[in-house]
């Protein structure tokens, strides 16, 4: 492939991106009665309008405002689960614990989950060859700005006790550069949020360390405390058992520490 077809360092727009977004929207609005009023064609038009014909390194949160407006959704503010570097388990959890919500359980998060997209300046074409990489090319790209925008709004909506699932297998359990660390933490509203409770998910079966004492968790506690929000932390030593107990809380083995 010639270099001019690889203008950016990241992968190109996901194949059949328009069809995928539209199909996901239709599916979501069918499953969620409170969103049945949403016109999926208008949602796609607004999504498209955010990045088509725009330089993929000059995207702003403002570009996504029409989409944000159409995708406005009320989720129970005290049932929010944030996550960092452990998406799959977070999603498995909310699939079982149906009254809790990750960002990807909302319409806008569901539409964009695992997709890549970008356009080109001054043309109506979607770029299926390559899109900007956050590190190698630019941070103000369509995908990064989208997630920054929806993540900020999601965090701003949270209240009471907010939960966050963190990956205990990573060298930085709490990473200031993650979306959680750079956006969500700073947009929790102290006047609404009482406590941030971190669930640190252990990877190894024999790992009995208290990862709540990890320096990066202490750093998170410090940031949260300075924002006048209380902080608590729990080790989830056995994520498989944890999920099983969410499914079957009456199970006798679920009284011990997970």
């Amino acid at each position: 492939v010639p270099r001019w077809r690889q203008q950016w360092s990241g992968p190109g727009t996901t194949k059949r991106f328009p069809e995928t977004v539209l199909a996901r929207c239709v599916k979501y609005t069918e499953i969620h009665p409170e969103m049945r009023h949403v016109d999926c064609q208008s949602v796609w038009d607004a999504f498209k309008g955010a990045f088509i014909s725009k330089h993929p390194c000059n995207i702003t949160e403002e570009d996504y405002q029409p989409l944000m407006k159409l995708g406005t959704q009320t989720v129970p503010c005290n049932k929010i689960l944030l996550w960092s570097r452990i998406k799959d388990l977070a999603h498995q959890f909310t699939q079982v614990q149906r009254d809790m919500f990750t960002l990807e359980d909302t319409l806008l998060g569901y539409l964009a989950d695992d997709l890549t997209w970008c356009g080109e300046f001054n043309t109506s074409k979607i770029n299926y060859q390559s899109c900007p990489d956050w590190r190698k090319d630019c941070s103000n790209n369509p995908v990064s700005v989208f997630w920054k925008t929806v993540s900020r709004r999601f965090a701003e909506a949270a209240c009471d006790v907010v939960h966050v699932m963190l990956n205990g297998s990573r060298s930085k359990i709490f990473d200031k550069n993650s979306t959680f660390g750079s956006v969500e933490v700073h947009n929790l509203q102290p006047e609404k949020v009482q406590t941030l409770e971190a669930w640190v998910i252990h990877g190894g079966r024999e790992d009995s360390r208290d990862l709540c004492q990890d320096p990066t968790i202490k750093e998170l506690e410090s940031i949260i405390s300075k924002r006048n929000i209380q902080f608590s932390c729990k080790n989830i030593y056995r994520p498989d058992k944890f999920l099983q107990c969410v499914k079957n809380p009456e199970d006798s083995s679920c009284t011990s520490e997970i």
Partner: antibody
């Protein structure tokens, strides 16, 4: 050595079609995109489009969309450019040119003069 | 069909330096590093002189150099020689898998 040899001059009537061939040798034909560029008498160069000889994928300049078709036959390492509904202002020398990857054209055919006249 | 703007003609004496400009927009020249330059003698096919803005193919004298600033690319020929007299064209990638040529410049060696 790399060579691109184009077919001979053509005289066509308005409304007709012309198909110009470009035979490649001296390199792996499927490894490089092939572009077509034309030049009207006394005028500048005009980019028409490209074909990926490996996949057969094409992209044409907006001006020629609907009138141009680029194809290839990998078995004989030859690219083709067909232009239909010819008009007198399509009179030009048509060049094929190899793209080594940087959006530049490092080897060119000798050019095929297509004259459109009634 | 958008084209890149070049001066119609440029001239210089042997040994002198000349510069040919090629002005586009942020959608082509300014947006990418895929600008090339071609020399064309009468009745001949064009010859690649500069690619990717400033790189020289083997066999092209180092008297030929390319540069870019904003939406304008430039070809500079130093130590002008009689055989440099020809037409020169710039070409740029223009996004969406398309390319655009310049209007062409006739170089006369006085």
């Amino acid at each position: 050595q790399v060579q691109l040899v184009e077919s001979g001059a053509e005289v066509k009537k308005p409304g007709a079609s012309v198909k110009v061939s470009c035979k490649a040798s001296g390199y792996t034909f499927t490894g490089y995109y092939m572009h077509w560029v034309r030049q009207a008498p006394g005028q500048g160069l005009e980019w028409m489009g490209w074909i990926n000889p490996n996949s057969g994928g094409t992209n044409y300049a907006q001006k020629f969309q609907g009138r141009v078709t680029m194809t290839r036959d990998t078995s004989i390492s030859t690219a083709y450019m067909e232009l239909s509904r010819l008009r007198s202002d399509d009179t030009a020398v048509y060049y094929c040119a190899r793209d080594p990857g940087g959006g530049d054209f490092d080897y060119w055919g000798q050019g095929t003069l297509v004259t459109v006249s009634s | 069909q958008p084209v890149l703007t070049q001066p119609a003609s440029v001239s210089g004496s042997p040994g002198q330096s000349i510069t040919i400009s090629c002005t586009g927009t942020s959608s082509d020249v300014g947006g990418y590093n895929f600008v090339s330059w071609y020399q064309q003698h009468p009745g001949k096919a064009p010859k690649l002189m500069i690619y990717e803005g400033s790189k020289r193919p083997s066999g092209v004298p180092d008297r030929f150099s390319g540069s870019k600033s904003g939406n304008t690319a430039s070809l500079t020929i130093s130590g002008l020689q009689a055989e440099d007299e020809a037409d020169y064209y710039c070409c740029s990638y223009a996004g969406s898998d398309t390319f655009v040529f310049g209007t062409g410049t006739k170089l006369t060696v006085l």
